[in-house]
Structure formats: structure tokens, C-alpha cells
């Protein structure tokens, strides 16, 4: 695609995209456009929605002109008795537009959660559900005595004016965050992910953090006391430095790890927190990565089978994360 020509956008102002559709830069980095959705035609100039894990599938390498927006492989979602593909958008009700992203559903309200402040034209604004309308609408009760607008105003109820508490919501965003997934490795450095729209633009995004349930080299079964079947949180004798792709953590950490059992149970993180860890690489580069730190572990029989695609929910989810 030729981006050498001067940028020319269809309109000076950014387009107004429908609910749940991202506003993105075109392939030339010139103009802001509404991202194409799952199954729609796309070009390098009209990109697919990256916040839904979509990419423009051009089919054969020779064809770089027109493609179809396709979802990167991700887990489907079950919502309200229906199955949705990762990247697929759907309306869960007249009030919400939802998107499936790798097994998690995030929704944005289609109804305005706008606040109305009192004015001479509408001294006592209230939100009410009108017959035949999906969304609540503002109505303006006229003051009983027009001459008493001033003194009467002091007596209106705050919640009548505001509707929902504005501190509880980002404007027009139903904030949702999934639990952290289980660590991708049962020993050594792995990845744990979650999906959230807790960001400035209420966009679904996948967040990841490093995780280590236990070091691979530790022979934890040796430490199980006689008569006991499990060691839930073994004591690690010395502080450790984490390693990632040849880079080493700048600080040492006295981290907690989960132990093992001899009776078929497995021990997994139960309460965790997320903290940034700086890694120094051989070339001197410093990179900062979020990492899971274990607070407590739990030993249970809900262990994932090697081929079990419906891994136990208990195992897949990380409870009580503070971040």
C-alpha cells in the first residue's frame, strides 16, 4: 500500500463510531476510521478492530488488496445460552452491546448514562422509564410555583438529579474485569491473562502478567513431613532472582511458591497480587513486566487433565487478586 502521498481524510473531524466499535488509525497512520468488525471486508486502509483480536485475512499472499476481518484463535464465549466466537459482537439486550474476547464477554451500554444538571429550562431533572422505550429518558418536572424556582431548588433530591452515582461509573462505560487465568506453566515462568475494559476508552483489552507457581528445579516432595500428604506453601530458603528470556530481575525476591501433594491433589495459587518487576538484559536494556506474586495457595482435587479443554473453573481462575 502506498502511503507516500499526503494524508487525505474524508472528514476533518474523527468519525462517530457505533457503540463497541473502536476508533483506530488507518494503515497509513493518517486518518482515524471506525474499525471493521468480524466478517466485514477490510483493506490496509480500513483495518480490523485490534481491540477485539481481529486481523485482516487477505487469503493468499499475492492478494494484499481486500480481506475479511477474522478472529485470532481465542476461546469462544457462552452467554445467555448462546455461543459466540472470539471477536464476535452481539446485543445482549436493547441496552447493551457486547463482545466476546478469548472466552470473556465485555459490554458497553447503548443507553446514555448521561447526567443532567439543573437549569432554568429543567430545574428538577429526573430519569424515567417511558412506555415502549428501551432506555430511560430525562424528564423535567416543572416547578409547582414558577416564582419559587429559587428557594425550591435547594430542596431537590440529589439522586433525582443524577440518577446513578456518577462516581460509580466512567461515563457510558460498564466496567468489567475477568479474573486472572491460571498460570500457563505448572512450574517455571509462565503467563497469566485477563480481559478488562477498565481503561480510558472502555475498550476490551487483554492484560498479561508473568507468573511462577513453583520453580521447576525444586524437589518439593522431599520436604513433605512424615504423615502429611501435602506441602501447601513450602518455605524457600533464599531470596531468588527471576529469569526471563535471558534477562534477570534487578532485585531479589523472597517469593512464595505453591507446593505439591502425594495423594493426587494439586496446589495452585489462591490469593495473588500483581507487582512490576524490572529485568536487566545482557545488552543493558531494562524491561518492566507485571508479575504475579502468590499470597496463599490451595490444594484441591480440581486438577487440569492433559487433554481437558474445559479445565476446572477453580483451576483456571485466580481469586483475590489485589491488582
Amino acid at each position: 500500500q502506498d502511503c507516500s502521498a499526503q494524508c487525505q481524510c474524508a472528514a476533518e473531524a474523527a468519525p462517530h463510531c457505533p457503540a463497541g466499535v473502536s476508533l483506530v488509525l488507518d494503515g497509513c497512520g493518517c486518518c482515524r476510521v471506525c474499525a471493521k468488525q468480524l466478517g466485514e471486508l477490510c483493506t490496509e486502509r480500513d483495518p480490523c478492530d485490534p481491540h477485539k483480536g481481529l486481523f485482516c485475512d487477505f487469503g493468499s499472499p499475492a492478494n494484499r488488496k481486500i480481506g475479511v476481518c477474522t478472529a485470532k484463535d481465542g476461546a469462544p464465549c457462552v452467554f445467555g445460552g448462546s455461543v459466540y466466537r472470539s471477536g464476535e459482537s452481539f446485543q445482549s439486550s436493547c441496552k447493551y452491546q457486547c463482545t466476546c474476547l478469548d472466552g470473556a464477554v465485555g459490554c458497553v451500554p447503548l443507553c446514555s448514562m448521561d447526567v443532567r444538571l439543573p437549569s432554568p429550562d429543567c430545574p428538577f431533572p429526573r430519569r424515567v422509564k417511558l412506555p415502549g422505550k428501551c432506555c430511560e429518558e430525562w424528564v423535567c418536572d416543572e416547578p409547582k410555583d414558577r416564582t419559587a424556582v429559587g428557594p425550591a431548588l435547594a430542596a431537590y433530591r440529589l439522586e433525582d438529579t443524577f440518577g446513578p452515582d456518577p462516581t460509580m461509573m466512567r461515563a457510558n462505560c460498564l466496567v468489567q474485569t475477568t479474573e486472572w487465568s491460571a498460570c500457563s506453566k505448572t512450574c517455571g515462568m509462565g503467563i497469566s491473562t485477563r480481559v478488562t475494559n477498565d481503561n480510558t476508552f472502555c475498550r476490551l483489552e487483554k492484560q498479561s502478567r508473568l507468573c511462577m507457581v513453583r520453580p521447576c528445579e525444586a524437589d518439593l516432595e522431599e520436604n513433605i513431613k512424615k504423615g502429611k500428604k501435602c506441602i501447601r506453601t513450602p518455605k524457600i530458603a533464599k531470596p531468588v532472582k527471576f529469569e526471563l528470556s535471558g534477562c534477570t530481575s534487578v532485585k531479589t525476591y523472597r517469593a512464595k511458591f505453591c507446593g505439591v501433594c502425594t495423594d493426587g491433589r494439586c496446589c495452585t495459587p489462591h490469593r495473588t497480587t500483581t507487582l512490576p518487576v524490572e529485568f536487566k538484559c545482557p545488552d543493558g536494556e531494562i524491561m518492566k513486566k507485571n508479575m504475579m506474586f502468590i499470597k496463599t495457595c490451595a490444594c484441591h482435587y480440581n486438577c487440569p487433565g492433559d487433554n481437558d479443554i474445559f479445565e476446572s473453573l477453580y483451576y483456571r481462575k485466580m481469586y483475590g487478586d489485589m491488582a
Epitope: S112, L117, P118, S119, D121, P123, W138, P151, L153
Partner: antibody, heavy 114, light 110 residues
């Protein structure tokens, strides 16, 4: 998402009529009124007039004789017409939503010059 | 002609408290003046902070509060943040029209 966008010619000749449009999205102009305000370069704000949700209007007395504000609810647009303009009308013109003047347009610069 | 007067400029240190006022030339400001406070940060659009004397817009932090104080409309900022540095305008309603104040330039030191 609530948005207001002013549009119109950037240059108007003296004695002509200045016509601006405020295009609204994210709310209905039959539910909220729309105000017009202007700001001279390096100066404060000056309220010009308002069209209320039910279509009634109120104007700054100083502009009463030459200002008309109207609306097209089907297009969710408010129009602003200021006649017999002079160089003193050179300013940035804004539309804003009623109710605490909570949302404003980015403004449109109007220069009156021959 | 009704005139609405604001302090031209005020300076405050981060974490401090400052009160901006809005005086009417024709008497005490009351709730029927529907005092509004509008903010403009450098390079940004105007946005309303307070409407109807004391009601915060959804984006207005709790450290901003609107009230009537000694016959004037007042905007009080408690625990001032560097990002509060801006121009603040008040607007008062007089039965048939609004009048804007001249604006207050708030500078946050440091």
C-alpha cells in the same frame, strides 16, 4: 458519547449575515437546550443566546435585533444567524449544551473582514 | 447592564485550598441564578464543572465544590492538584439571559 460540532464560513464580509450550525450527537435537542457563546481574542466569554428543548429562545439583549437561533430536531442541528456583522463580531463561536454548560463544541473562528 | 465579577487571577500551592467567587452587580446571588462553573485548560475545550449552584458534572472530582458564600457564588477547590491549573468562568442566569464573569486564571505553583 456526547459531541457538539460548530461549522460555518471562517470569513464573512461586513454587513452580511453570519450563519453557523451546531451539529449534535449523543443527546437529543428535544431533551436538552443549546446555547451559543463567543470569545473575542484574548478576552472572556460572552453569552449570545439559547434555544430551549421545547423550541423557545432567549437572547442577549445586545443582540436581540440581529440574532436568530432555530433548530431542526430531525437532523439534531441548531442554527445561528447573526445579521449586519461588523469587525467587532470577529471571535470564536461556541455551542454548548444546556444543564451546567457541561458539553461544548471545539469552537469555530469567524473573521469579519472585507 | 448586569455585570458578573470574578477574581482575575489566583495562585495556590499543590494540596492547598482556594475559593473562586462570582459576584453579581445587582445584589446577592441566589439559587435562582443557577450558578454554573466552566473550566478551560490550555489547549483543551471548555467543559462544565458545576451546574445549578452545587451539582457536579460526572467528570468533576469531589475536590471541587460549588456553593453560595456571602451573597456570591463560590467554587472551592480543596487539595488542589497541578492539573487544576486552568481558566475558570462562572455564568449566572437572570430570568431571561445568562451573563458570564470575566474568568479567573488559577495558577498552581511548583
Amino acid at each position: 458519547e456526547v459531541q457538539l460540532q460548530e461549522s460555518g464560513p471562517g470569513l464573512v464580509k461586513p454587513s452580511q449575515t453570519l450563519s453557523l450550525t451546531c451539529t449534535v450527537s449523543g443527546f437529543s435537542i428535544s431533551t436538552f437546550g443549546v446555547h451559543w457563546i463567543r470569545q473575542h481574542p484574548g478576552k472572556g466569554l460572552e453569552w449570545l443566546g439559547v434555544i430551549w428543548r421545547r423550541g423557545g429562545t432567549d437572547y442577549n439583549a445586545a443582540f436581540m435585533s440581529r440574532l436568530t437561533i432555530s433548530k431542526d430536531t430531525s437532523k439534531n442541528q441548531v442554527s445561528f444567524k447573526l445579521s449586519s456583522v461588523t469587525a467587532a463580531d470577529t471571535a470564536v463561536y461556541y455551542c454548548a449544551r444546556d444543564g451546567g454548560f457541561d458539553y461544548w463544541g471545539q469552537g469555530t473562528t469567524v473573521t469579519v473582514s472585507s | 447592564e448586569t455585570v458578573v465579577t470574578q477574581e482575575p487571577s489566583l495562585t495556590v500551592s499543590p494540596g492547598g485550598t482556594v475559593t473562586l467567587t462570582c459576584r453579581s452587580s445587582i445584589g446577592a446571588v441566589t439559587t435562582s441564578n443557577y450558578a454554573n462553573w466552566v473550566q478551560q485548560k490550555p489547549g483543551q475545550a471548555f467543559r462544565g464543572l458545576i451546574g445549578g449552584t452545587s451539582n457536579r458534572a460526572p467528570w468533576t472530582p469531589a475536590r471541587f465544590s460549588g456553593s453560595l458564600l456571602g451573597g456570591k457564588a463560590a467554587l472551592t477547590l480543596s487539595g488542589v492538584q497541578p492539573e487544576d491549573e486552568a481558566e475558570y468562568y462562572c455564568a449566572l442566569w437572570y430570568s431571561t439571559h445568562y451573563v458570564f464573569g470575566g474568568g479567573t486564571k488559577l495558577t498552581v505553583l511548583g
